[in-house]
Amino acid sequence: FPMFKRGRCLCIGPGVKAVKVADIEKASIMYPSNNCDKIEVIITLKENKGQRCLNPKSKQARLIIKKVERKNF
């Protein structure tokens, strides 16, 4: 679960409510920065099926964020 800061929001819209756990390759969390004032959770899917923005307010996103914060802090 990498964590990094960057400029400008990447996700168009809030994102999907959930992604099948079996489809998740990795999850990246982008914390608010000068140019993007919200947290963004980007899921990379297995088998080169692209990525999905996961709604940071969803239950699944909150679990992922918690897991990352436990690991990093």
Epitope: R8, C9, L10, C11, I12, G13, G15, V16, K17, A18, V19, I42, K49, G50, Q51, R52, C53
Partner: nanobody, 118 residues
Amino acid sequence: EVQLVESGGGLVQAGGSLRLSCAASGFTFDDYAIGWFRQAPGKEREGVSCISSSDDSTYYADSVKGRFTISSDTAKNTVYLQMDSLKPEDTAVYYCAKDCIIPPIGSWGQGTQVTVSS
């Protein structure tokens, strides 16, 4: 190779309409999220709309809500952005984005220019 080709832009008077198309190839269209974003000269890029098949959801930026409609034709692997009641401030180059995620600047498509005159 994933390819997204935008078309349908043009010059239109304020209050007019345009329909943009985003033709997708190089990936399966059964579980997709495709978005539109725009870049006006001297302005920040702006996410405009997104459609996602996995949860049948659509999103619209506040600036276009009630005027723009996003839709898709899975048989044609194409996503459309119907733009009605256009305003001069909608003038920009419009790009489509796979996964509803704005890619790094170097990998944007050619986009389609929309110019709204007053």
